[in-house]
Interface confidence: medium
């Protein structure tokens, strides 16, 4: 049924979903507050623009009665309950900020007749690709996939003078929603790293991924794997590993990398950890002072929802259009804007691009190195370091076949 | 399952130091974080410090610049240097552990996040 949207008069409403069932396990208290300080910031500017406007947001709780899995598993119904409470109470805003979870965002959006945008905080997985009005605000596994393509086949730097074609992926069912997401992407036989890729084969068992270690009839040393480190300890431990392997750990959403009193521990040594680049004011900001390195990301994305927001509404009243047509629904895309710690650039999709990481551990310091950025919005690998101190021979990363020479 | 023995405490006065060792059962590297936490009398049990994977330290405001947990992997044990130490650093200290993120990647801030514990060794800073 059709519900009318408190937007319009001067006085524009944000509904923002608050799931018991989310990609991440932060209290909902922090998730308010990183909506308030967006609030704040938003009024601020719409009244620099001489925008004399009401904004406000709606939290809009779930029961919690059944969907009560805490993780993402039993997220589908308690999103569409959520619409359906919301339908209800005939208070819908100009924009619904909500579901992190794939799973509950690909219903909604499947469900309902949308004729206006959706913010989320998550829903990583391919299947919330190329949704007309669903804009997402941490890295989908598509923007994964094809760091790893082009990383893969990129042969012409001084620490990587092989094109890569083979890997393994690792992903035992236990993973964060995040790496749930990023490694079914990988593993999907239509998926662009599948097609792209020549051999790939998922490990799923731990004794799997450590025969492969030292295996001489491995068809590839490339492993894939997603997680925190500890997740990689729990597999290898102190196992010895073959010298032209290279274990690939997928961690976008940690900044632990990056602090000063970080010291990579040994078992390191033959991973590369591809995370996101930290913004700049973050780390020491008062907004984050209370969260883990793990956590400001997905509390940072509500914040910039509702940054991306105050955006596009301040650009459609200055414009004088209106707020609740299709337009509007559609125009959260393709565009920059001004986030909590810097820009924040949306692609054609409505998907945030972002400078992925790749770091290494230095032999030398013990330290993580940046290695190379990759620019999600170009599709495009910066080498950072040239003469990585690197455990592997000559400080060049293995080809991906053993015994196979230059290509 | 992850056994956690605490030793290193006693009595000491004011401005004076300890060094708490906290045996697991388990590899520290193979946690997801472990911390410390105190206990005065009367009071809630309180975070002071932890370590998350990567190595990522963080402390209470209180202990800032004065504590330090660090780690070593072979010997198995965690540990909380405490110099300075003040009669307001009374209490029972425990150490705890949280071996997997889980599919929500725990933060490891509060006592919830945290499964295993380990006995306590009490602490008492006279002035």
């Known amino acids: 049924s059709q519900v009318s949207q408190n937007c319009h008069n001067g006085s524009y409403e944000i509904s923002v979903l608050m799931m018991g069932n989310s990609a991440f396990a932060e209290p909902l208290k922090n998730l308010e507050d990183a909506v308030n300080e967006g609030l704040e910031i938003v009024r601020g500017r719409l009244q620099n623009a001489g925008l004399n406007v009401t904004v406000n947001a709606t939290f809009m709780y779930s029961d919690g009665l059944i969907h009560n899995s805490g993780d993402c598993r039993s997220s589908t119904c308690e999103g569409l309950d959520l619409l359906r409470k919301i339908s209800n109470a005939q208070r819908m805003g100009c924009v619904l900020i909500g579901p992190s979870c794939t799973y509950s965002t690909f219903q909604m959006y499947l469900d309902t007749e949308l004729s206006y945008p959706m913010i989320s905080a998550g829903s990583f997985g391919l299947s919330c690709d190329y949704k007309e009005t669903l804009t997402r605000l941490m890295s989908p596994a598509r923007k994964l996939m094809y760091f790893l393509v082009n990383f893969w086949k990129t042969n012409d730097l001084p620490f990587k003078t092989y094109s890569w074609s083979t890997s393994y992926v690792y992903k035992n069912g236990t993973e964060t929603e995040d790496c749930f997401w990023y490694l079914n992407a990988l593993e999907a036989s239509v998926s662009y790293f599948s097609h792209e890729l020549g051999f790939k084969v998922v490990l799923r068992q731990d004794k799997e991924f450590q025969d492969i270690l030292m295996d001489h009839n491995r068809k590839s040393n490339v492993i894939i794997m997603c997680g925190g480190p500890e997740f990689l300890y729990k597999l290898k431990g102190d196992r010895a590993v073959a010298e032209d392997i290279v274990i690939i750990l997928v961690d976008l959403f940690n900044d632990q990398y990056f602090e000063d009193n970080v010291t990579a521990p040994d078992y390191m040594k033959n991973v590369l950890v591809l995370t996101l680049s930290p913004g700049n004011s973050l780390l020491n900001s008062s907004f984050s002072r209370n969260l883990s390195p793990t956590k400001r990301d997905f509390a940072l994305a509500y914040l910039n929802g509702i940054l991306l927001f105050g955006h596009m509404l301040k650009i459609f009243l200055e414009n004088g259009e209106n707020i609740t047509t299709p337009k509007f629904a559609h125009a959260f895309r393709n565009l920059t804007f001004e986030g909590y710690d810097g820009p924040v650039t949306l692609d054609d999709w409505g998907d945030v691009d972002s400078t992925m990481v790749l770091l290494y551990t230095s032999v030398d310091t013990k330290k993580y190195k940046v290695l190379l950025t990759y620019d999600t919005h170009v599709n495009k690998t910066y080498p950072v370091d040239m003469s990585p101190t690197f455990t592997w021979k000559n400080s060049k990363l293995p080809n991906d076949i053993t015994g196979r020479g230059p290509q | 399952q992850v056994h956690l023995v605490e030793s290193g405490g006693g009595s000491v006065q004011s401005g004076g130091s300890l060094r708490l060792s906290c045996a697991t059962s388990a590899s520290p590297y193979s946690m997801h974080c472990m911390g410390w936490f105190r206990q005065a009398p009367g009071k809630a049990r309180e975070r002071v410090a932890s370590?998350?994977?990567?190595?990522?330290?963080t402390y209470a405001d209180s202990v800032k610049g004065r504590f330090t947990i660090s780690r070593d992997n072979a010997e198995k044990t965690l540990y909380l240097q405490m110099n300075s130490l003040k009669p307001e650093d009374t209490g029972t200290y425990y150490c705890?552990?949280?071996?997997?993120?889980?599919?929500?990647?725990?933060?490891?801030?509060?006592?919830?996040?945290?499964?295993?514990w380990g006995q306590g060794t009490q602490v008492t800073v006279s002035s």
């Open positions: 705890a552990a949280r071996p997997d993120a889980g599919r929500w990647r725990s933060a490891c801030t509060t006592e919830l996040d945290f499964g295993y």
């Open positions: 370590i998350l994977n990567a190595g990522s330290t």
